[in-house]
């Protein structure tokens, strides 16, 4: 197979120049060289570096390779911070909350949107050609720390927040941003970067439009989004589906699958020391799994590990996320297929409203068909190499539940043996919130870390049971997660990328990189459980709460 | 196994029409792209047309645009080829296929795209 270059910009994907650079290890994370811009063009930039290349007889010291990053990059950072119009310090959901102390640390979040909103210099649109960054019309707020640029399925969370706060046309401009990469690339790529564009990211623009109406109510937005809407649908069904036989029928579902050539260009040191010693097509196949982990957001965990036995046991390269299946990509998708039949018929074109109904209706009808394990009773994601059950615990295993991806009737029917589950799995017994998996695997995508994205699908899914224990475990998930947050917000005066699920307000760690401060989808999702959940919620068991 | 059967093959004089079809044996139709391919004798097997799953989106071969229209029915799980203007260089073996799913990219006119195949209806465009 012809793979694809892992961008159109050599300097930042494919070259001898990005080769050299990371390896030296000129900065301890890989991310650094591919975020600088160029100060000369890309051909003068490429030409000089040969000719630098071959004068030191093609093996230039570290100090001579950071004199030339020196002189032909820099940092003069390609965003300004933004004021956003719509920003209040005092926004209306603040007066649901009845615990004082949540109520401060619902303010305290809500004054780090300005903190986190930023916009592209004229300059990246005028060059931009010299930049890894893509240049977007509309502000944005970023994760925070490393991530100075968009992510795609961060922004749901990003989104939710902001549209709790009353920030409706911040949101707005975020989702038109990522309306404008899809126009640019034919899909959205996992962030704002030129070095992201061959991979994407769990699709949840759909969901974002779908709360973004749900609390606008904006329809012209709908009516002159939903091309792209279905353009977005389309994108994995053109280039990530999958068949499944089980029981003799083949059914459709899909994967993270992104082949391009190389490395990852901000993780390149990475991963080029771990395919030393490999063949040339187990080093590209390790390329094309870990970028496919990559796009699934969970870089890395256990839940892509898999052996010859069929486990999860291993380490970074027994990665095969090609062979599979996830339950929360395809829970996603059935949800993003059920908005665009729900915005179609809001926008009265009942043959597509059927069309994409009928769409969702065959995903969920696969899901179950294919990921249900009805000994545990529990989705499970789904090895296709050995046409078996993955049966661990991962918080992503009820997505289904989390978008009304299952039968209602179905669902009556399981209740009690899925809340069963949930509960026995002991992925809700911790302190510090809801931890990904129960492996300690030393990647961030396992335990003891605590990502705010899965909590919040976690507390969605244990309420969409919709018994009344789902409904209180649900609260009583969402309540030890905002502990954990506020007490280290208490401690440490700022919010985390990841928690700690075995010590409340400590921040995870593990994989790539340091934790990052900020940051963008912990302060939406803790909003999203103030909004929900305020009249309930306490800071801590004295019920010490002055009703205001 | 995904089955497919093709029908409405035969014998047309230049300028006439023809329709082809091709019926899939399970549900799942309805999530795939579907194509048709020929193959003349001696020749390579090449591209005429194909369909996205939703039938919004049609792609063509620059040798038959404007007189083949390729549609489906998801309900019936059937693919058609509505064949106008024959001529005698349309005579081929017409084949039904699958993209069941992807092995890469999105190319729609490449036989390697395809995962099943039908066995094909003879078309003969003679006078």
């Known amino acids: 197979m012809d793979l694809p270059l892992t961008c159109t910009k050599p300097v930042y994907c494919n070259s001898n120049l990005l080769h050299q650079i990371q390896m030296a290890r000129l900065y301890n994370d890989s991310k650094t060289f591919v975020d600088l811009q160029m100060n000369f063009d890309e051909n003068k930039t490429l030409t000089d570096f040969e000719t630098f290349f071959n004068l030191h007889n093609k093996n230039p010291t570290k100090e001579q390779l950071m004199e030339f990053v020196n002189e032909y990059f820099s940092n003069d950072n390609e965003l300004e911070p933004w004021q956003p119009k719509d920003f209040s310090d005092n926004p209306a959901f603040l007066a649901k909350i009845k615990d004082d102390a949540l109520r401060e640390f619902g303010k305290g979040i809500n004054n780090i949107w300005p903190l986190l909103a930023r916009k592209v210099k004229a300059e990246v649109f005028q060059k931009p050609d010299q930049f890894s960054l893509v240049p977007l019309t509309h502000g944005f707020i970023i994760p925070g720390g490393r991530f100075k640029e968009i992510y795609y399925w961060d922004t749901f969370w990003i989104i939710e927040g902001l549209l709790i706060s009353g920030m409706q046309e911040t949101a707005k401009g975020m989702i038109e941003n990522l309306i404008e990469l899809l126009n640019l690339f034919g899909h959205i790529p996992n962030g704002s970067r030129g070095y992201y564009q061959q991979r994407s990211q769990p699709p949840m623009l759909n969901a974002m439009v779908a709360t973004y109406y749900m609390y606008t109510k904006d329809l012209e937005f709908l009516r002159n989004n939903i091309a792209y809407l279905e353009k977005e649908l389309d994108f994995w069904m053109d280039n990530r589906v999958v068949s499944v036989n089980r029981g003799g029928k083949n059914y459709t579902l899909l994967r993270y699958y992104a082949p391009s050539k190389g490395p990852r260009p901000e993780s390149y040191y990475e991963d080029y020391s771990n395919t030393e010693g490999f063949s040339e097509e187990d080093s590209t196949n390790f390329c094309i799994d870990i970028k496919s982990a990559a796009e699934s957001g969970w870089d890395f965990s256990t839940r892509w590990f898999l052996m010859p036995d069929g486990s999860n046991n291993g380490t970074l390269t027994d990665l095969h996320t090609r062979y599979i299946i996830p339950v929360d990509l395809n829970a996603i998708f059935a949800g993003a297929a059920q908005y665009v039949s729900n915005f179609h018929a809001l926008l009265k074109n009942p043959q597509k409203a059927a069309r994409y109904g009928q769409l969702a209706q065959t995903w969920r009808d696969n899901i179950q068909a294919v990921l249900w394990n009805d000994q545990d009773a529990m989705w499970y994601d789904f090895n296709i190499r050995d046409n078996l059950h993955r049966r661990y615990y991962y918080s992503s295993n009820a997505a289904p539940l989390w978008q009304n991806a299952v039968n209602p009737d179905f669902l009556k029917l399981n209740a009690d043996r899925i809340l069963k589950a949930i509960t026995e799995s002991g992925g809700v017994d911790f302190p510090g919130g809801v931890p990904t998996s129960l492996i300690r695997s030393g990647e961030q995508w396992d335990f003891p870390n605590v990502w705010p994205p899965e909590v919040s699908i976690e507390v969605a899914a244990i309420e969409n049971i919709g018994t009344p224990e789902a409904i209180t475990l649900a609260q009583e998930v969402a309540q030890t997660f905002v502990r954990s947050c506020h007490w280290g917000f208490q401690k440490y005066k700022q919010m985390f990328e990841k928690y700690d699920a075995e010590t409340p307000g400590r921040f995870g760690g593990g994989g790539e990189y340091n934790v990052q401060f900020g940051f963008g989808w912990s302060n939406g999702v803790v909003l999203e459980f103030l909004n929900k959940y305020g009249s309930q919620l306490t800071a801590d068991d004295s019920n010490n709460t002055n009703n205001s | 196994q995904v089955q497919l059967q093709e029908s409405g093959g035969g014998l047309v004089q230049p300028g006439g029409s023809l329709r082809l079809s091709c019926a899939a044996s399970e549900r799942t139709f309805r999530t795939y792209t579907m194509g048709w391919f020929r193959q003349a004798p001696g020749k390579e097997r090449e591209f005429v047309a194909a369909?996205?799953?939703?039938?919004?989106?049609?792609y063509y071969a620059d040798s038959v645009k404007g007189r083949f229209t390729i549609s489906r029915d998801n309900a019936k799980n059937t693919m058609y080829l509505q064949m106008n203007s024959l001529k005698p260089e349309d005579t081929a073996v017409y084949s039904c296929?699958?993209?069941?799913?992807?092995?890469?990219?999105?190319?729609?006119?490449?036989?390697?795209?395809?995962?099943?195949w039908g066995q094909g209806t003879q078309v003969t465009v003679s006078s």
């Open positions: 296929a699958a993209r069941a799913y992807s092995i890469g990219y999105y190319y729609p006119n490449a036989l390697s795209e395809y995962n099943y």
């Open positions: 369909i996205r799953w939703n039938g919004d989106s049609t």
